[in-house]
């Protein structure tokens, strides 16, 4: 999906209003210095591409974040403010249902969500030069 046509200001507002708090809740009990940010993004469409990938694609050691509250809200925000996003996700959602696993918070998942927090922070500051 090409995130170029999303309403970035609305997605930012959704993040600041509620998604950010759910990410903090997920990470509660974890020191903010515990994980290094290794994933970066260069502009808002690229940030949303990376956020979608880290949130919804299973990775080794972290099978699924998709049922977490922050993930459900992220999916909803993209569906509302990225034209055509919902339609592209129908097949992906059906595939995900087939491989759904029980929720387990592993250290790998915590690391992944820490990366997500970094990507969201970057998304919210699009005019900053890349380090």
């Amino acid at each position: 999906y090409d995130f170029t046509n999303c309403d970035f200001e609305k997605i930012k507002a959704a993040y600041l209003s509620t998604i950010s708090k759910d990410l903090i809740t997920y990470m509660s009990g974890t020191k903010s210095t515990e994980f290094n940010n290794t994933v970066s993004c260069s502009n808002r469409p690229h940030c949303l591409t990376e956020i979608q990938s880290l949130t919804f694609n299973p990775t080794a050691g972290c099978a699924s974040l998709a049922k977490e509250m922050f993930a459900m809200k992220t999916k909803a925000a993209l569906a509302i403010w990225c034209p055509g996003y919902s339609e592209t996700q129908i097949n992906a959602t059906q595939a995900m249902k087939k491989r759904r696993k029980r929720k387990v918070t592993t250290n790998k998942c915590l690391e992944q969500v820490s990366q997500l927090q970094g990507l969201w922070r970057r998304f919210n500051r699009p005019l900053l030069k890349q380090q």
Partner: nanobody
Framework: QVQLVESGGGLVQAGGSLRLSCAAS????????IAWFRQAPGKEREGVSF????????YYADSVKGRFTISSDNAKNTVYLQMDSLKPDDTADYYC?????????????????????????WGQGTQVTVSS
């Protein structure tokens, strides 16, 4: 240009009723979501109720569930908030607000409807005072 005009506020005794109206113009009403917010003196603006004009889906804040009813008349481009069993705690300025994408994504909007930062257009407000 876009306009939202609220009316129907006033002074009412506890246990009484009021019906607020929000008349909209300047945009395609059927595509939009309209929400009612309220702000009491010294408090933050809070979401009261939401309706999708495209499918009629409605959401309510817990504090008003069972007492307030939101409805929409698409022919008149107007949204109503029927407020029954009013309490002194309901005293506030009431505002209606419109948003252009949540109206056609009402199921996903359950997470976001109550956040004022997401709305594009606002009315000037109408005052509701509930005396004990």
């Amino acid at each position: 240009q876009v306009q939202l005009v609220e009316s129907g506020g006033g002074l009412v005794q506890a246990g009484g009723s009021l019906r607020l109206s929000c008349a909209a113009s300047g945009f395609i009403f059927d595509d939009y979501a309209i929400a009612w917010f309220r702000q009491a003196p010294g408090k933050e603006r809070e979401g009261v109720s939401f309706i999708s004009n495209s499918d009629g889906t409605a959401y309510y804040a817990d504090s008003v569930k069972g007492r307030f009813t939101i409805s929409s008349d698409n022919a008149k481009n107007t949204v109503y908030l029927q407020m029954d069993s009013l309490k002194p705690d309901d005293t506030a300025d009431y505002y209606c607000a419109a948003e252009g994408r949540m109206g056609t994504h009402s199921r996903d909007s359950v997470y976001f409807w109550a956040f004022s930062a997401l709305y594009d257009y606002w009315g000037q407000g109408t005052q509701v005072t509930v005396s004990s």
